[in-house]
């Protein structure tokens, strides 16, 4: 059966979110600088559960800390300024999770590094895309 237009739109939004998150991860992994060590000392909260679009609330709540860590890097590896990257991500997250639903995010007990955090959300996006295909 043909994929509905709303599903296709969701897939494209998730692809855009993936692109931004992978861009950040790519920039960090390419970052040959002592600042990388410092970046990895910052801790991020991870969702206890992330299987539905509403769980993107947990990502939204960590976008400010993410921007602060990226500002440390002052690197051209991110292709865009951290503020613009985070702004892009914020817009997409709001569209995907919807602004009407109020969802209280539950966080796991263990915190994570920026690399673990990004890997978790990239995996989440790819997983949702796969289920929509």
């Amino acid at each position: 059966a043909p994929t509905s237009s709303s599903t296709k739109k969701t897939q494209l939004q998730l692809e855009h979110l993936l692109l931004d998150l992978q861009m950040i991860l790519n920039g960090i992994n390419n970052y040959k600088n002592p600042k990388l060590t410092r970046m990895l000392t910052f801790k991020f909260y991870m969702p206890k559960k992330a299987t539905e679009l509403k769980h993107l609330q947990c990502l939204e709540e960590e976008l400010k800390p993410l921007e602060e860590v990226l500002n440390l890097a002052q690197s051209k590896n991110f292709h865009l300024r951290p503020r613009d990257l985070i702004s892009n991500i914020n817009v997409i997250v709001l569209e995907l999770k919807g602004s009407e639903t109020t969802f209280m995010c539950e966080y796991a007990d263990e915190t994570a590094t920026i690399v673990e955090f990004l890997n978790r959300w990239i995996t989440f996006c790819q997983s949702i895309i796969s289920t929509l295909t």
Partner: nanobody
Framework: QVQLLESGGGLVQPGGSLRLSCATS????????MGWYRQAPGKQRELVAV???????NYADSVKGRFTISRDNSKDTMYLQMNSLRAEDTAVYYC????????????WGQGTLVTVSS
């Protein structure tokens, strides 16, 4: 060194057509999700079109019915056929290729400028 190289940009009149190409090294082509995004000065980056490793395509509403994304596995090249171009399509167009499994490697080109103006 892994590279993506865009070509085909230029100046075109409204209503005209252009075909962008993205040449890649084979190691980052087959099986990877690929796409085109554009960046216009002072605007949010826009994801224009995507094609999965299996050939599934997806388009932004703003280009649907006008743009067509395709890939030629034998040439390790992806294309974006742009028809009925409008002034608002003016932007730098970048192609990208991303892994769909860890370690989530991402590659993108230097971009090609498309200017739609009379």
């Amino acid at each position: 060194q892994v590279q993506l190289l865009e070509s085909g940009g230029g100046l075109v009149q409204p209503g005209g057509s252009l075909r962008l190409s993205c040449a890649t090294s084979g190691t980052i082509f087959s099986g990877y999700t690929m796409g085109w995004y554009r960046q216009a000065p002072g605007k949010q980056r826009e994801l224009v079109a995507v094609i999965s490793g299996g050939g599934d395509t997806n388009y932004a509403d703003s280009v649907k019915g006008r743009f067509t994304i395709s890939r030629d596995n034998s040439k390790d090249t992806m294309y974006l056929q742009m028809n009925s171009l409008r002034a608002e399509d003016t932007a730098v167009y970048y192609c990208y290729s991303r892994e769909v499994t860890p370690p989530w490697k991402l590659y993108w080109g230097q971009g090609t400028l498309v200017t739609v103006s009379s």
